[in-house]
């Protein structure tokens, strides 16, 4: 034996399935037999690696059987049908029922054939991104934080970054046992260059159809950045007046802007308005230094500028002019 | 009801043969597979052999080859073992029994090889 | 071929008992094995298929395990009515294979 015939029956199935927590998932196991071939099948069989005895048995004579009745129950399997199709599904799927299992058909005149099948329990992660507020701290902290809460099995987390900096990622229990919250830091010395900069956290999981993409927006806390804009060394006496502005980069945004100058208080010819510092025409040549003192949530900072104004050429009477 | 009833005792000669026969009711012949089991006197069980009534495939045990044959009849839903050739080592009771495992059991059929 | 193996050829026990036939499979038979019971004069009778499920009309004392190669039929409360013989069989692959039997007396 087996008996003669074009070729042998075969028990067919996929080697791995993949299941969600908590859903239900079906186990394909089909009996092919080939065009010549004869057989008769007298039960469906499903049994589990290292378990003793059966899950689900399907007799001809008997109908089904399961060793959980509420979580078990074969697809397509009838009294009175042939047994070709022993596709069984399970409901409400634990972390435990992940494993081998064994699908078996007993078959006249071949015998028992049977396959193994491998359930992954799987459970899709939820995934978050956030943003780590900091300062200027002169050293590497973590700028930006990536979370995927619940995955089975971890999530793998990269991060895609113009910045420089590295990762930390770790690993706990999810809330779900059998489950895993990766949690991923991006690493980075806190610069103002990386105020407003973004990175982008990548969490692939297998039941995922692409990888995610979730971008976070750097946020570094700092001290006004100043510098003085608006002279061109060729400020001349009796032009329209002209005007010097105060840039301040800075996070928070700046709250105040103070103009003064080495001497102490503005001249009569300053005039302070805001960021913007109005000078007037003046008649006489002057060689001023100005202040001007920005504050912000974290401090103040101040850049100085020395203006002069020269008896210039007749020729050239707008050289001061600036607006 | 399933029920298999099988034929009558036999006494048989040495050398002869007999044909024993297991008459099927209360299920569709068809259905299930056909088994035949010999007990020797205070013995265990042994398998001679099946069919499938379907399709008149058989499977033997190699023991048995060229001792047993198998048949059906499905007109009359009845499947028939022939012993050839019997010795005293034959002499037992012989039972059908469908299904596998083996289910539904004939009464049995003693058979006693003597001269 | 499977041999299938019942080393206790006799086992004695009281009404009310509970007793343990075991049979061993010389291979793999994974849960094909079935359990029958033969009264004196009787054909046998199916109790248990599929290592551990009883068939329809069997008393739930009767109660069969495991898988593989070892395989248990334990009957609790034992009957006067269950004065029998008990024989295993393995139907995973052909020649199907019974063990000798395990004779239950009843004291």
């Known amino acids: 034996w087996p008996p003669p015939g074009t070729g042998d029956i075969i028990v067919q199935a996929p080697t791995q399935v993949p299941g969600f927590l908590g859903d239900s998932v079906t186990l394909p196991c089909y009996l092919q037999v080939p065009g010549m071939e004869e057989t008769h099948v007298s039960q469906l069989t499903w049994s589990r690696h290292g378990e003793s005895g059966s899950m689900a048995v399907f007799h001809q004579t008997q109908g089904p059987n399961y060793s959980e009745p509420k979580r078990l129950e074969f697809v397509a399997a009838r009294l009175g049908t042939e047994l070709r199709d022993a596709s069984l599904r399970m409901f409400g799927l634990r972390v435990e029922d992940e494993g081998n299992y064994t699908c078996l058909f007993v078959t006249f005149p071949q015998g028992s054939r049977s396959v193994d099948i491998w359930l992954r329990v799987l459970a899709k992660p939820q995934n978050t991104a956030e943003v780590q507020k900091v300062q200027l701290t002169g050293k590497p902290v973590p700028v930006a934080r990536c979370v995927s809460t619940g995955g089975r099995p971890p999530a793998h987390i990269t991060w895609h970054s113009d910045l420089g900096g590295m990762p930390n990622t770790s690993q706990a229990p999810g809330f779900l046992s059998g489950t895993v919250t990766v949690t991923s830091l991006w690493i980075l010395v806190p610069s103002s260059q990386v105020d407003g900069k973004s990175v982008t956290c990548k969490v692939e999981h297998e039941s995922f159809e692409k990888p995610q993409l979730l971008t976070v927006n750097l946020t570094v806390y700092y001290p006004p950045e100043v510098s003085i804009s608006g002279y061109d060394n060729n400020w001349y006496l009796s032009q329209n007046e002209a005007t010097l502005t105060c840039d301040a980069r800075s996070n928070p945004e700046p709250t105040g802007y103070n103009w003064s100058t080495t001497m102490g208080p503005l001249p009569p010819f300053a005039v302070a308005q805001g960021a913007q510092l109005l000078i007037r025409p003046v008649d006489k040549p002057i060689n001023t230094t100005f202040i001007c003192n920005v504050t912000n949530a974290l401090g103040a900072r101040q850049a100085e500028l020395t203006v002069q104004v020269k008896e210039g050429p007749p020729s050239e009477p707008s050289g001061m002019s600036s607006n | 009801e399933v029920q298999l009833q099988q034929s009558g005792p036999e006494l048989v000669k040495p050398g002869a043969s007999v044909k024993i026969s297991c008459k099927t009711s209360?299920?569709?012949?068809?259905?299930?597979?056909m088994h035949w089991v010999k007990q020797s006197h205070g013995e265990s069980l042994e398998w001679i052999g099946g069919i499938d009534p379907n399709n008149g495939g058989t499977n033997y045990n190699q023991n048995f080859k060229g001792k047993a044959t198998l048949t059906v009849d499905k007109s009359s839903s009845t499947a028939y073992m022939e012993l050839r050739s019997l010795t005293s080592e034959d002499s037992a009771v012989y039972y059908c029994?469908?299904?596998?495992?083996?289910?539904?059991w004939g009464q049995g059929t003693s058979v006693t090889v003597s001269s | 071929d499977i041999v299938m193996t019942q080393s206790q050829k006799f086992m004695s026990t009281s009404v009310g008992d509970r007793v343990s036939v075991t049979c061993k499979a010389s291979q793999n038979v994974y849960t094909n094995v079935a359990w029958y019971q033969q009264k004196p004069g009787q054909s046998p009778k199916a109790l248990i298929y599929s290592a551990s499920y009883r068939y329809r009309g069997v008393p739930d004392r009767f109660t069969g395990s495991g898988s593989g190669t070892d395989f248990t039929l334990t009957i609790s409360n034992v009957q006067s009515e269950d004065l029998a013989d008990y024989f295993c069989q393995q139907y995973n692959s052909y020649p199907l294979a019974f063990g000798s039997g395990t004779k239950l007396e009843i004291k």
């Open positions: 209360g299920y569709t012949f068809t259905e299930y597979t």
């Open positions: 029994a469908g299904v596998i495992p083996l289910e539904y």
